[in-house]
């Protein structure tokens, strides 16, 4: 099994993967296979109403650049506080004991894997110890040690909407064959998206591929700078009783998903007021409705907030509210 795989992202479309060769390989390692697939955002993120008081936005981090060759794994996306700081709780005695047991088990298990499970993978149909997965056509990079061109994932993961994650059959997973080195730059990835990366060491190329069980690592690409900006105009309509319906287009390819919109509006000469529009409310209204506005000239700006943070404020839109008698509550149904 390849050791200590580390995945980091250096851009919104690339992940760098590094690893160490197996400590005790069965024969010579001829090449490595790297598979990757896009991961769906945690379904819980879709359920929460981030406009509710006291509910903090999830601060998803991408996988940061390497600190050094021997730096710790920076692979899992984490929930962080607003300062971006994470600290682990002190370990209990039972946790320490459990980790020691796991460490011991891992050594024994890896020995077992090397001796028993390191079996041939046949690419054509036949009998014997076959890989149960479908065979995959692979593009070889030959013996060139520094070529790291990756298969773009656009075809494998067409963007059907701002937050959809298509479920591709396993045989369509993009992958790369890596020869004579222990690193790979995976390119053509979607911005601010989590990927699950699978790494296998192989000690025979033809006629039968003999590969280890996989080591897994996860990484998230960096955010795209303007992906969370609302494109196009903010439109409005003033209905009777001065109900103002504001509408805007959601960002087409946001960083992860849009969790809320901030509506900032002010009457000329007054303080700015803020309104939070949840993802669910936006899905119903394609915007929001304002009530209870005193007569006067208003300006309004809107920005989206995604898993990666805030987009830019839109250009101000202006409207005029005439005088009327009854003033109901603030945000309309």
């Amino acid at each position: 099994v390849p050791l200590d795989p580390i995945s980091v992202s250096n851009s919104s479309s690339q992940i760098i993967l590094k690893w160490k060769p197996p400590s005790d390989p069965n024969g010579n390692i001829t090449h490595y296979l790297v598979f990757w697939e896009r991961q769906a955002e945690d379904s819980e993120l879709f359920e929460l109403d981030y406009c509710l008081k006291g509910l903090k936005l999830p601060s998803r981090t991408w996988s940061p650049p390497f600190e050094s060759e021997d730096s710790q794994k920076h692979n899992q996306s984490e929930y962080e506080d607003s300062a971006g700081e994470c600290c682990s709780c002190p370990k209990t005695d039972s946790q320490i004991l459990k980790e020691l047991e796991e460490s011991s088990f891992r050594k024994t298990f890896e020995d077992y894997l090397h001796n028993v499970v390191f079996v041939p993978r046949k690419t054509s149909s036949g009998t014997g110890a076959e890989d149960p997965r479908p065979s995959r056509k692979r593009r070889s990079l030959g013996d060139v040690g520094n070529v790291t061109v990756a298969v773009p994932t656009v075809a494998a993961f067409p963007n059907t909407s701002s937050t959809s994650v298509p479920t591709s059959p396993e045989e369509h997973r993009p992958f790369e064959k890596v020869v004579n080195k222990e690193s790979l730059v995976i390119s053509g990835l979607r911005h601010f998206t989590g990927y699950r990366i699978e790494l296998q060491a192989c000690n025979q190329d033809t006629p039968e591929e003999r590969c280890s069980v996989a080591a897994y690592v996860s990484a998230r690409t960096m955010p795209e700078a303007k992906a969370d900006d609302i494109v196009g105009p903010v439109t409005h309509e003033i209905f009777e009783n001065n109900v103002v319906h504001l509408m805007w287009q959601e960002p087409k390819e946001p960083n992860g998903l849009i969790v809320l919109y901030e509506v900032s509006y002010r009457r000329y000469g007054d303080e700015e007021l803020h309104l939070c529009v949840s993802r669910k409310h936006f899905a119903l209204e394609r915007g929001c409705r304002l009530r209870g506005l005193s007569p006067g000239n208003y300006s309004v700006r809107i920005r989206a907030t995604s898993l990666a943070g805030n987009g830019s404020w839109t250009e101000p839109t202006y409207f005029y509210v005439t005088d009327y008698l009854d003033v109901p509550s603030n945000i309309a149904k």
């Epitope: 909407s161 998903l257 915007g287």
Partner: antibody, heavy 119, light 108 residues
Framework: EVQLVQSGAEVKKPGESLKISCKGS????????IGWVRQMPGKGLEWMGI????????RYSPSFQGQVTISADKSISTAYLQWSSLKASDTAMYYC????????????WGQGTLVTVSS | SSELTQDPAVSVALGQTVRITCQGD??????ASWYQQKPGQAPLLVMY???SRPSGIPDRFSGSRSGNTASLTITGAQAEDEADYYC???????????FGGGTQLTVL
Amino acid sequence: EVQLVQSGAEVKKPGESLKISCKGSGYSFTSYWIGWVRQMPGKGLEWMGIIYPGDSDTRYSPSFQGQVTISADKSISTAYLQWSSLKASDTAMYYCARLGSGSYSFDYWGQGTLVTVSS
Amino acid sequence: SSELTQDPAVSVALGQTVRITCQGDSLRNYYASWYQQKPGQAPLLVMYDRNSRPSGIPDRFSGSRSGNTASLTITGAQAEDEADYYCNSRDSSGNHAVFGGGTQLTVL
């Protein structure tokens, strides 16, 4: 391509239960409300209710409250409409539709499921 | 009875302009949407909000609203426009949606 695919036609007896389905694809199922619309033979469209699959928030038209149950399983991108005890008057074409473009507008529709209730 | 009222039937000569109306108190405070339904087919959204057309809908279709009345206008009606047309908006509470009774459009 956005698609809503509904389950096939059903023939049932009064008093029986039924659950029909609507599978969404080509978009983020959890991010859009899904609604159900009834059309009785030779009649107009009737808005039954909507569900937000992200958190299963459901809103029923007063006419259908207590008569049907709308639910969703986001893990398989499917919405459901069910009856615990069918009546002959439930005979109709039932459409699922996605609230998408604009305010309270159904921008994509399923092909419809014909439910026939007869003794 | 529906909270949105439509004329049951309207006819128009080929190539002429026709206006289909939808009346209801809720239209003073909410947008209307319009759907076209041909026999044996699911409804199709043709107009929403102030005057927005989904992609693929010809520009001969337009929408407007004044007071408690929303209108769908077809300028230069074609034979393929013959269908039932339904308006849709919120009910007076604003919590639910309702459809109008439908207008059968005949192109002569």
